[in-house]
């Protein structure tokens, strides 16, 4: 016999990562015919929804009005349908933005290189933070995480025309806090490629993750709840 | 040592090519790419182009667009540089200069004198 | 194309003092500004890279600021070896270009 229900989705609208005082909505699907949601922040129980009537309703929204760093951390959903508990979520890790600095992006040797050049991005932030984030806009988001006092390089090594695109930094005071994102870098990549094993070896996503980001709530935008879980799990661990 | 030598002067007549060459040593010649600058008698340099001996990718000067031709060997660790169509305006002399991917041009050649002259 | 221009375009100095050279860009370049040495029958030199980033080798009386569009080169108590043609150099975008030069001499 069953002894627990299927674990439901849990994903944040419009994104995982939030400007300082502005809205989310974490957002949990379970199963028709759920009674209660429990939303766990840390570990902890953080809030309850009893949808009605709960037979039409397979989702329940937790909304966060005005996010800041107490807010940002660890979520975790679990329902029930009758007496019998669900399996927790995957684990939802909300970041508030815009904190406190702003960091400098800039590119070695140039933002125009040819293909096939070594290309060194560097992230500086003179605030006390160790870890940076490097994004990449576009449909297949690109994201690397880089350590240093006061500056992180993200070397991308030989590059193809693959790399080209806009990419923004981040300071990151703790897993949950990140600064303000860095003025945009544009990287051009000029010349034909003729060695097919200088393919990048970024993590993609097959989503536009700077653009998402930049969205506001009230495009209602609903995102693939899975992928969202996975790329904040590769984003943030 | 880093060294980047040049293929001797070059007296051409109007209307032919001429190929030089550039050997460089004491580096891995695919890590670095190699670019060409141009310049004429008591003037200033101008960039010609660059080729990537890693993937073989180049980028040219619009203003000599088609005069020059970058290539590489990369088994003896040689750029070159073809120039076509020559006429007196090209005469100058030519270096090749290595692109570090931490600063800009951190070695050059020798640099090679050009003449073209009927 | 991104166009520096140089000023002055002939420096006289006394050997012992100090001077300053101009590099004003068409647009903005950030920090992606290098500048060169090349003395007479010689190759260029790279002095500064990024504006204001020093080159090992290079003795430390070489020294560049600036940002966006207007930089300068400071050579701080000039030696008799510093005569030559200072080039400044665009490292942002093709074509990578350099400006038309201020030539260095002694009084």
């Known amino acids: 016999q069953q002894q627990t229900l299927p674990k439901p989705f849990i994903w944040a609208e419009p994104h995982f990562m939030v400007p300082k005082e502005k809205q989310v909505t974490i957002c949990c699907q379970g199963n028709y015919g759920a009674v209660e949601y429990q939303l766990h922040f840390e570990g902890s129980l953080f809030a309850v929804d009893r949808p009605k009537p709960p037979e039409r309703i397979n989702k329940v929204q937790f909304y966060i009005p005005d996010m800041n760093s107490r807010m940002a951390g660890q979520y975790s959903c679990i329902y029930r349908v009758g007496e019998l508990w669900s399996e927790p979520s995957n684990l939802l890790d909300l970041v508030v933005t815009e904190m406190y600095d702003t960091p400098t992006l800039s590119v070695h040797p140039g933002p125009e290189v040819i293909s096939g050049e070594k290309v060194t991005f560097y992230c500086r932030l003179d605030t006390a933070t160790s870890m940076f984030l490097l994004l990449k806009e576009g449909r297949s988001s690109h994201v690397q995480r880089g350590y240093g006092k006061v500056q992180a390089e993200f070397p991308l090594g030989p590059v193809t025309t693959a790399h080209r695109g806009t990419y923004r930094c981040f300071g990151s005071y703790n897993n949950h806090a990140w600064s303000f994102p860095s003025e945009p870098v544009k990287l051009l990549v000029t010349g034909d490629i003729e060695n097919t094993s200088l393919a990048p070896e970024d993590p993609t996503f097959p989503a536009d993750t700077w653009g998402t980001y930049l969205l506001t709530t009230e495009t209602g935008l609903q995102k693939d709840h899975a992928l969202w879980d996975h790329t904040a799990q590769n984003l943030l661990r | 040592e880093v060294q980047l030598q040049q293929s001797g002067p070059e007296l051409v007549k109007p209307g032919t090519s001429v190929k030089i060459s550039c050997k460089t040593s004491?580096?891995?010649?695919?890590?670095?790419?190699m670019h060409w600058v141009k310049q004429s008698h008591g003037k200033s340099l101008e960039w010609f182009g660059g080729?990537?001996?890693?993937?073989?990718?180049?980028s040219y000067n619009q203003k000599f667009k088609g005069k020059a031709t970058l290539t590489v060997d990369k088994s003896s660790s040689t750029a070159y540089m073809e120039l076509r169509s020559l006429t007196s305006e090209d005469s100058a002399v030519y270096y090749c200069?290595?692109?570090?991917?931490?600063?800009?041009?951190?070695?050059w050649g020798q640099g090679t004198t050009l003449t073209v002259s009927s | 194309d991104i166009v520096l221009t140089q000023s002055p375009a002939t420096l006289s100095v006394t050997p012992g003092n100090s001077v300053s050279l101009s590099c004003r860009a068409s647009?903005?370049?950030?920090?992606?500004l290098h500048w060169f040495q090349q003395k007479s029958h010689e190759s260029p030199r790279l002095l500064i890279k990024?504006?204001?980033q020093s080159i090992s080798g290079i003795p430390s009386r070489f020294s560049g600021s600036g940002s966006g569009s207007d930089f300068t080169l400071s050579i701080n108590s000039v030696e008799p070896e510093d005569v030559g043609v200072y080039y400044c150099?665009?490292?942002?975008?093709?074509?990578?270009?350099f400006g038309p030069g201020t030539k260095l001499e002694l009084k």
């Open positions: 200069a290595r692109r570090d991917f931490h600063s800009s041009f951190d070695y």
């Open positions: 004491g580096y891995t010649f695919t890590e670095y790419s």
């Open positions: 080729i990537s001996p890693n993937s073989g990718g180049t």
């Open positions: 647009q903005s370049i950030s920090d992606y």
């Open positions: 990024y504006a204001s």
């Open positions: 150099q665009n490292g942002h975008s093709f074509p990578l270009t």
